[in-house]
Interface confidence: low
């Protein structure tokens, strides 16, 4: 339906609190460098304007689109040219080009560093003094670091953050209560950000069809009792919601997500038996709960897949009449029967099935041609299965840190041109697949691992796209979304790589290393390992083990010394010389 004033419509639907939060997120995701106070001022102005439009929808400018209104407001920022350079040129454009321009300038790696949590008492004082400001600051800090964060979900995490402080600021030992809860929330937020980034990349780089295929597979696994038509409706709505959020239309996105949650809860009987608990919750929690809900049980007596997709004499007729719908039903039927498969694997099987029908339906005897199509799936299923088995065994043998280092070596040898910080970040994330998935029951490992790896490799693709340095990375990232992981897995050592010149600077360490938290200490060591490999790409596992062992001893020795800085200055060059000799 058309509304006289779009901004009034969204304000009424969302309510002031959520409206304010979403506008703050939108501004923070677009203007990532601006101070919090500047954003608060803009949000207040937009909110007051919206209230005016609610009171009188025919008031001046109330008929303008949200992009026009929010874009005009962004373009009033005085420091735009100084802080953002050419992004200021976006303001010369008219909508919709202006919004597209802003989107292109979003920075996936703004370099603000991890959000540091100040001391517990200070946090609780700030929380009690001005709860709204405290939570607004949280939204701002997350949004500017994660410019594609799923906005309505970020509002949910802000509520969870509020809950943590409400509880812990009353506790006897505030820090003991806060630290584990804030850390656990940080992990969830980072995971949520990375997942949404993959959804946005899928929509932006591979189109709506790719996103819908992914969603059909995922929802069919979660809601195997739902009919195909029901799944299709949910997928269409979901595609609209994520297109909006990925496109910066956060108010529409949040409003549509709330509508979808309402629809799902009103139609639980035809979707899933597991939704009752979710549907009693308030809107943000309800949507979050639905997105995380456990899988429903499979309906009894499902016929074998072959009946409709191999044995039916009408296979080619059905396929040629409505290719997307027929392939959609194949993906739906296969996915609901295989909750243990990763979405990526299910999509590869659907692609293989499509390729077989394309080939066979053009022959004289199609049924004979596609009779054994399911046998052609075996290697596609075995490849990720073996990969997960091998890597989980390696993880169990080495532990998380050792497993990360093995992956660092593997990926640096595959794509040595990639920057050291990116290789370290991505390999550390890849290495977390062990503790995240290898501890699962056998039946859940594959889907957990491969779908998690897709999310992590998307991060590599996003970072690499910003500063492309490797044709191999570009190829794996752009050729096929579902084959990204197999593409990276298949990469061998890059024999064309010219080793990096040795630089003593890279291997110079100081006493500040000793006071770093464990994770940051690991990052320093892992960065040194990457640099070592870039200098000596042919180094053997044994040589690397020796050098890294020596490095660990060197750090331990100097951090235990009376005069730490003197020790680093004296022992550092010796270590470098020894390392060069060991790798000669």
């Amino acid at each position: 339906e058309a509304h006289q004033s779009e901004i009034a419509h969204r304000f009424n639907d969302l309510g002031e609190e959520h409206f304010r939060g979403l506008v703050l997120v939108a501004f923070s995701q677009y203007l990532q460098q601006c101070p919090f106070e500047d954003h608060v001022k803009l949000v207040n102005e937009v909110t007051e304007f919206a209230k005016g439009c609610v009171a009188d929808q025919s008031a001046a400018n109330c008929e303008k689109s949200l992009h026009e209104l929010l874009g005009d407001k962004l373009c009033t920022v005085a420091s735009l040219r100084d802080k953002y350079g050419e992004m200021a040129d976006c303001c010369e454009k008219k909508e919709p080009e202006r919004n597209e321009c802003f989107l292109q300038h979003k920075d996936d790696n703004p370099g603000f560093g991890q959000l540091v949590t100040p001391e517990a008492d200070a946090m609780c004082t700030a929380f009690h003094e001005n709860e709204q400001r405290f939570l607004g600051k949280y939204l701002y800090e997350i949004a500017r670091r994660h410019p594609y964060f799923y906005a309505p979900e970020l509002l949910y995490y802000a509520e969870e953050y509020k809950g943590v402080f409400t509880e812990c600021c009353e506790a006897a030992d505030k820090a003991a209560c806060l630290t584990p809860k804030v850390d656990a929330l940080r992990e969830k937020v980072l995971a949520s950000s990375a997942k949404e980034r993959l959804k946005c990349a899928s929509l932006q780089k591979f189109g709506e069809r790719a996103f819908k295929a992914w969603s059909v597979a995922r929802l069919s696994q979660k809601f195997p009792k739902a009919e195909f038509a029901e799944i299709s409706k949910l997928v269409t709505d979901l595609a609209k919601i994520h297109k909006e959020c990925c496109h910066g239309d956060l108010l529409e996105c949040a409003d549509d997500r709330a509508d979808l949650a309402k629809y799902i809860c009103e139609n639980q009987d035809s979707i899933s038996t597991k939704l009752k608990e979710c549907c009693g919750k308030p809107v943000l929690e309800k949507s979050h709960c639905i997105s995380e809900v456990e899988r429903d049980e499979l309906p009894a007596d499902l016929p074998p897949l072959a009946v409709d997709f191999v044995e039916d004499k009408e296979v080619c007729k059905n396929y040629q009449e409505a290719k997307d719908v027929f392939l959609g039903t194949f993906l739906y039927e296969y996915s609901r029967r295989h909750p243990e498969y990763s979405v990526s694997l299910l999509l590869r099987l659907a692609k293989e099935y499509e390729a077989t029908l394309e080939k066979c339906c053009a022959t004289d005897d199609p049924p004979a041609c596609y009779a054994h199509v399911f046998d052609e799936f075996k290697p596609l299923v075995e490849e990720p299965h073996n990969l997960v088995k091998t890597n989980c065994e390696l993880f169990e043998k080495l532990g998380e840190y050792g497993f990360q280092n093995a992956l660092l070596v593997r990926y640096t040898k595959k794509v040595p041109q990639v920057s050291t910080p990116t290789l370290v970040e991505v390999s550390r994330s890849l290495g977390k697949v062990g503790s995240k998935c290898c501890t699962h029951p056998e039946a859940e490992r594959l889907s957990c691992a491969e779908d998690y790896l897709s999310v992590v490799l998307n991060r590599l693709c996003v970072l690499h796209e910003k500063t492309p340095v490797s044709e191999r990375v570009t190829k794996c990232c752009t050729e096929s979304l579902v084959n990204r992981r197999p593409c990276f897995s298949a990469l061998q050592v890059d024999e064309t790589y010219v080793p990096k010149e040795f630089s003593a600077e890279t291997f110079t360490f100081h006493a500040d290393l000793c006071t770093l938290p464990e994770a940051e200490k690991q990052i320093k060591k892992q960065s040194a390992l990457v640099e070592l490999l870039k200098h000596k790409p042919k180094a053997t596992e044994e040589q690397l083990k020796t050098v890294m062992g020596d490095f660990g001893s060197f750090v331990d020795k100097c951090c235990a010394a009376e005069d730490k800085e003197a020790c680093f200055a004296e022992e550092g060059p010796k270590l470098v010389a020894a390392a060069q000799a060991a790798l000669a």
Partner: nanobody, 128 residues
């Protein structure tokens, strides 16, 4: 009401591996966080490891991190504790425990306290 039955405990040498199992029966297993605890002679019962109701998040006491792995098989209503590189100080009676899930999210952490249901225990002895 949930009934829990541990098995798999025995006498092993230091550095050996052992896998403990805990079979659950009764109320729906899927809606419970599961944990392993242990009690050495003359000491208080201590938390070892826990896994949340969906098997997605785990928690370990520092002394067993990297050596022990907790997992669950929802279809078989069983939780496992894979113990590698055992040490004499791991000698204890190991108890399996269950508690109502701590959160609606499958990523909600399992927690170390508030367990309502307990098994009888299984003895693990590690000799040097």
């Amino acid at each position: 009401q949930v009934q829990l039955q541990e098995s798999g405990g025995r006498l092993v040498q230091a550095e050996d591996s052992l896998r403990l199992s805990c079979a659950a029966s009764g109320r729906t297993f899927v809606s419970y966080d599961m944990g392993w605890f242990r009690q050495a002679p003359g000491k208080e019962r201590e938390f070892v490891a826990a896994i949340n109701w969906r098997g997605y998040t785990t928690d370990y006491v520092d002394s067993v991190k990297g050596r022990f792995f907790i997992s669950r098989d929802i279809a078989k209503s069983t939780v496992y504790l894979q113990m590698n590189n055992l040490k004499p100080e791991d000698t204890a009676v190991y108890y399996c425990a269950a508690r109502q899930m701590s959160g609606s999210s499958r990523y909600s952490p399992p927690g170390r306290v508030g367990y309502d249901f307990w098994g009888q225990g299984t003895q693990v002895t590690v000799s040097s």
